[in-house]
């Protein structure tokens, strides 16, 4: 950021999207602001319009190409600028030299489905979305299960320290409604963070067989 009252944070989804959030202390006048992306070794540049997400925070997505196209590599540096209109001119509000593979946040896992469910266990699978082939198997996952009467925040985290796109949940209660979420993170990148949580998958365990304990 240009100064201490401004915070400009961006993440690369590893394929063709850079998502940015810019926050500024002290409300700006009703003005138009954009993020401009200028790669150091690519012929393209890209712009997105910052839209308010709160009173002092704006966000936008730089769409660099088709969702699964590999637009940047670990050697790229992208100059990202926040530009706001004042009068007829543009004023730079924040700038950063962005290293995409040091600032990764993947898309949330998708296609969650129950592979097999029993009274006390459930096998669930998912897929990762728009993740670079560069990672090979260097990914980790966190999962959580929402039990009746609890909140997501209370749910214990299960860690999968490898690229494993399934989980077998054990010690579940028969005939009970649960929800399940998973998120993913590459091992690469100093400022890399977890993806958003997936959409919750609801499932119900099978009832216990009658006449059995």
């Amino acid at each position: 950021a240009v100064n201490g009252t401004s915070r400009f944070t961006c993440f690369y989804n590893s394929r063709a999207n850079i998502s940015c959030v810019w926050s500024q202390d002290g409300a700006l006048q009703d003005t138009s602001c954009q993020v401009h992306a200028w790669p150091d070794r690519r012929r393209w540049n890209q712009t997105c319009e910052l839209l308010p997400v709160s009173q002092a925070s704006w966000a936008c997505n730089l769409i660099l190409g088709t969702p699964d196209s590999q637009k940047l590599t670990a050697v790229d540096i992208v100059t990202l600028r926040v530009m706001c209109r004042e009068g007829v001119r543009w004023r730079m509000m924040a700038i950063q030299d962005f290293k995409p593979f040091e600032n990764l946040r993947l898309m949330a896992p998708i296609s969650l489905q129950v592979v097999h469910v029993e009274t006390h266990r459930c096998n669930i699978s998912w897929k990762i979305s728009q993740a670079s082939h560069y990672f090979e198997r260097h990914l980790e996952f966190e999962a959580r299960t929402l039990s009746p009467g609890h909140t997501w925040e209370e749910a214990p985290l299960m860690t999968l320290k490898q690229k494993q796109e399934w989980i077998c949940l054990e010690t579940l209660t028969p005939d009970t409604q649960y929800e399940f979420q998973v998120r993913v993170k590459p091992l690469q990148g100093e400022f890399t963070t977890w993806s958003p949580w997936s959409q919750p998958l609801a499932f119900r365990t099978k009832p216990a067989a009658l006449g059995k304990d």
Epitope: V2, N3, T5, S6, Q24, V88, W90, R91, M93
Partner: antibody, heavy 121, light 112 residues
Framework: EVQLVQSGAEVKKPGASVKVSCKAS????????ISWVRQATGQGLEWMGE????????YYNEMFKGRVTMTRDTSISTAYMELSSLRSEDTAVYYC??????????????WGQGTTVTVSS | DVVMTQSPLSLPVTLGQPASISCRSS???????????LEWYLQRPGQSPRLLIY???NRFSGVPDRFSGSGSGTDFTLKISRVEAEDVGVYYC?????????FGGGTKVEIK
Amino acid sequence: EVQLVQSGAEVKKPGASVKVSCKASGYTFTDYVISWVRQATGQGLEWMGEIYPGDGNTYYNEMFKGRVTMTRDTSISTAYMELSSLRSEDTAVYYCARGSYTYDNYAMDFWGQGTTVTVSS
Amino acid sequence: DVVMTQSPLSLPVTLGQPASISCRSSQNIVHSNGNTYLEWYLQRPGQSPRLLIYKVSNRFSGVPDRFSGSGSGTDFTLKISRVEAEDVGVYYCFQGSHIPWTFGGGTKVEIK
């Protein structure tokens, strides 16, 4: 060499309008802003507003809103400033000046020679 | 609007001697991006203004190093280390941080 050449002196009656031109050369006209600044006789400088020739977008100082109109003709790299409902206090030298489209460093780097507008009955 | 007040109004100087002009703004002119867009322009007799200093202390290309700018917040100064004959004219400070942008009233530098 960057040059801004303005139209000649004008004498106008109160209530009339005046249109001052500013012809740019030595740079890409549509890449920079043209600001207009006036200087009443023996007085200081007053920023009136500006136009971006690239898209014709304008911004006017509140003080002149409703009376000033800034336009451009990109085919001849010329910017215009029209001031209406003239009164004696509008007697001044009117300057055009070039400015960067992104205000990273300074507002105005090159100036026209000025156009004297006299408002007298 | 931000009012820019310059002092003195007139400054008689001796060739080869230093000169100093003050400019005060009615409010802080640090822009929300952290920069201070304080500029100095010189208008020689019968000429158009020309840019000398931008962002408080940066000399524009071709401006001699005897000109220097300093200050912060609301108080700014233009110094000429050794005045030369070509430095005669009216000096204006200008703020480009808050629209509408405004000029100071000017300081007339003349040789004693």
